[in-house]
Interface confidence: low
């Protein structure tokens, strides 16, 4: 399996909410001995290996934001810690998983990484990640809503997020 990032860039005004999304692609083993660990973190724009460095999102580490479940099951972080920081990560049974950030500030600008680890009990683990940029803007040139830019060839380069 691999991880796809539908959008590589999110440009949002201050104060807006945004949902960053990753999608699990390919065959997913739904056996009872397989679980998926999904999480989010910030990273730096290292030119050799993207997402190699794990920085917290609004002081929450990737451990704080993780989802742990089997196959394409739905899950979400509803614990108070994340919500107190205006964050919520979620996953659906179609392989999509996301992190929602509320009331964006300029400090939220940066590179965000989603991480999926397939854990096969007593055997091995397979990990893949995806990266996307969030740019929070202020002032006269800031968009009125979030604008998202596809990662690869699609009909529209910029789609205004609802």
């Amino acid at each position: 399996f691999k991880v796809a990032t539908p959008y590589s860039l999110y440009v949002c005004p201050e104060g807006q909410n945004v949902t960053l999304t990753c999608r699990l692609l390919g065959p997913v083993d739904k056996g009872h001995d397989v679980t998926f660990y999904k999480t989010w973190y910030r990273s730096s724009r290292g030119e050799v290996q993207t997402c190699s460095e794990r920085r917290p999102i609004r002081n929450l580490t990737f451990q704080d934001l993780h989802l742990h479940h089997g196959g394409h099951q739905a899950a979400n972080t509803s614990h108070d810690l994340a919500q107190r920081h205006g964050l919520e990560s979620a996953s659906d049974h179609h392989g999509n998983f996301s992190i929602t950030m509320r009331n964006l500030t300029l400090l939220d600008s940066g590179l965000y990484c989603c991480l999926v680890v397939e854990i096969r009990h007593h055997h091995s683990e397979h990990r893949v990640h995806g990266a996307m940029e969030l740019q929070v803007q202020t002032g006269k040139d800031a968009p009125s809503n979030c604008v998202v830019y596809p990662s690869s060839s699609q009909d529209s380069e910029n789609i205004t997020a609802a």
């Epitope: 590589s8 860039l9 440009v11 730096s44 724009r45 030119e47 300029l106 600008s109 990266a131 940029e133 740019q135 803007q137 002032g139 040139d141 800031a142 968009p143 604008v147 830019y149 596809p150 990662s151 690869s152 060839s153 699609q154 380069e157 910029n158």
Partner: antibody
Framework: QSLEESGGRLVTPGTPLTLTCTVS????????MAWVRQAPGEGLEWIGT??????TYYPTWVKGRFTISKPSSTTVDLRMTSPTTEDTATYFC??????????????WGPGTLVTVSS | DIVMTQTPSSVSAAVGGTVTINCQAS??????LAWYQQKPGQPPKLLIY???DLASGVPSRFSGSGSGKQFTLTISGVQCDDAATYYC??????????????FGGGTEMVVK
């Protein structure tokens, strides 16, 4: 990963010219590519960027004088529609960190020289 | 259009000394700024990105700082090999479709 520009030569003013950047080991569906030029003894001047999805961005001064395209999975073209003597420069192609416009140029080609003269 | 103004246009440095090069954006670009080094007959080489992050393989004597509109490249313990022209680059993405030239005018450094 490498980039190499080609197509630079002596042309007369008004004669269209296409420069080609040939990439090796680079997935053009994942990275933005840019063209940057440098007139003799002058600084760097950004001409434009083509995103991973094929969308193009140009500075305001370009005004249709240049067109960037991706004709294949390994080439990025810069078309000079009607060159003037002021377009005499070394033309570089560069690979961005990521797929969209706002990016750092981590990898550059050696450049190709275009001379526009009558 | 965002305009990038680089100062000084030239600087002379002694081996072992320290040099600072400044770059000013006409409006805030947060930390979306890179620095490049270019030697005659060669393409530019990335030194610093995100205003202060060192690109791989770049010696630690190069450092970057700043945010918003004001940025600085500092070269400590200057070496002969550092003689080159240095450029700043703005890569702030604006949803306003007007883009200026993203590079500063360059600073030529001579090492004595």
């Amino acid at each position: 990963q490498s980039l190499e520009e080609s197509g630079g030569r002596l042309v007369t003013p008004g004669t269209p010219l296409t420069l080609t950047c040939t990439v090796s080991g680079i997935d053009l569906s994942s990275y933005a590519m840019a063209w940057v030029r440098q007139a003799p003894g002058e600084g760097l001047e950004w001409i434009g960027t083509i995103s991973s999805s094929g969308h193009t961005y140009y500075p305001t001064w370009v005004k249709g004088r240049f067109t960037i395209s991706k004709p294949s999975s390994t080439t990025v073209d810069l078309r000079m529609t009607s060159p003037t003597t002021e377009d005499t420069a070394t033309y570089f192609c560069a690979r961005g960190h990521y797929g969209y416009f706002g990016t750092v140029f981590a990898l550059w080609g050696p450049g190709t020289l275009v001379t526009v003269s009558s | 259009d965002i305009v990038m103004t680089q100062t000084p246009s030239s600087v002379s440095a002694a081996v072992g000394g320290t040099v600072t090069i400044n770059c000013q954006a006409s409006e805030s670009i947060q930390t979306y700024l890179a620095w490049y080094q270019q030697k005659p007959g060669q393409p530019p080489k990335l030194l610093i990105y995100d205003a202060s992050d060192l690109a791989s393989g770049v010696p630690s004597r190069f450092s970057g700082s700043g945010s918003g509109k004001q940025f600085t490249l500092t070269i400590s313990g200057v070496q002969c090999d550092d003689a080159a022209t240095y450029y700043c680059q703005n890569y702030y993405f604006s949803t306003n479709s007007n883009y200026g030239d993203v590079f500063g005018g360059g600073t030529e450094m001579v090492v004595k």
